[in-house]
């Protein structure tokens, strides 16, 4: 279905918050969900091929949260 790559056409970057209003990033499923549907992360199973997050949800003030510092974002703009 494709025929040969060419130069990238960029678009303006969205705001750093990852979800549209009224949605929050769910660390278990790794995508935005309705904020009311957020679940508490479970412990990561040993040897899981699609690992569950290792961390608890925390308030999102650190947009640059690293490993072990995952955060629950407030509703944001895309």
């Amino acid at each position: 279905m494709r025929r040969g790559p060419r130069s990238l056409r960029g678009r303006d970057a969205p705001a750093p918050t990852p979800c549209v209003p009224a949605e929050c990033f769910d660390l278990l499923v790794r995508h935005c969900v309705a904020c009311g549907l957020l679940r508490t992360p479970r412990p990561k199973p040993a040897g899981a091929s699609s690992p569950a997050p290792r961390t608890a949800l925390q308030p999102q003030e650190s947009v640059g949260a690293g490993a072990g510092e995952a955060a629950l974002p407030l509703p944001g703009l895309l």
Partner: antibody, heavy 118, light 107 residues
Framework: QVTLKESGPGILQPSQTLSLTCSFS??????????VGWIRQPSGKGLEWLAH???????YYNSVLKSRLTISKDTSKNQVFLKIANVDTADTATYYC??????????WGQGTSVTVSS | DIQMTQSPSSLSASLGERVSLTCRAS??????LNWLQQEPDGTIKRLIF???RLDSGVPKRFSGSRSGSDYSLTISSLESEDFVDYYC?????????FGGGTKLEIK
């Protein structure tokens, strides 16, 4: 402006290890809920997701190819790497990297062509 | 793994025509579906995310909808640049999976 660019060897031989690099700008992999994934497309065929890595170093792999895939990142250099071990002619494809956010892949690289041939 | 069955695999249509492409999910994926456009040179662009939300800069003639496990991309009035390839992508769970693609050709 978010941009991603893939680079690779172009051509390699069966049984070798394919090493791909995704160099990106306009975002950081130290940012919450950011990730980068790899997708490939054999000529004239559809898209196949391979692997992705998140800001917190969680990694996800295509279950069929998992034993041959290794994804990693260098956050300070804004780069993500994919290695595919023991390649075969079936691995001949265009390889794309893409940024991941709250709604999967939103920005894609231009693709790099890889040919496996003896 | 979740299978995404995309139809039709190819479609011939005329300028100004309204067309719809469909993807059917083998399991529940909620609204976790995107539509992608691939140009002849390989450039890939996301058009629709979360089933029905339009990406910035995408013309309003594109729209996405859902009916049960069927997801549709509709182009209300085809323009010349729309005759390219389209893919759906589910991201409800890993592994992410794509539909087989639809090649939209000019009649």
């Amino acid at each position: 402006q978010v941009t991603l660019k893939e680079s690779g060897p172009g051509i390699l031989q069966p049984s070798q290890t394919l090493s791909l690099t995704c160099s990106f700008s306009g975002f950081s992999l130290s940012t919450f809920a950011m990730g980068v994934g790899w997708i490939r497309q054999p000529s004239g065929k559809g898209l196949e997701w391979l692997a992705h890595i998140w800001w917190d170093d969680d990694k996800y792999y295509n279950s069929v190819l998992k034993s041959r895939l290794t994804i990693s990142k260098d956050t300070s250099k804004n780069q993500v790497f994919l290695k595919i071990a023991n390649v075969d002619t079936a691995d001949t494809a265009t390889y794309y990297c893409a940024r991941l956010g709250g709604y999967a892949m939103d920005y894609w690289g231009q693709g790099t062509s890889v040919t496996v041939s003896s | 793994d979740i299978q995404m069955t995309q139809s039709p695999s190819s479609l011939s249509a005329s300028l100004g025509e309204r067309v719809s492409l469909t993807c059917r999910a083998s399991q529940d994926i909620g609204n976790n579906l995107n539509w992608l456009q691939q140009e002849p040179d390989g450039t890939i662009k996301r058009l629709i995310f979360a089933t029905s939300r339009l990406d910035s800069g995408v013309p309003k003639r594109f729209s996405g909808s859902r009916s049960g496990s069927d997801y549709s991309l509709t182009i209300s009035s085809l323009e010349s640049e729309d005759f390219v390839d389209y893919y759906c992508l589910q991201y409800a769970s890993s592994p992410y999976t794509f539909g087989g693609g639809t090649k939209l050709e000019i009649k």
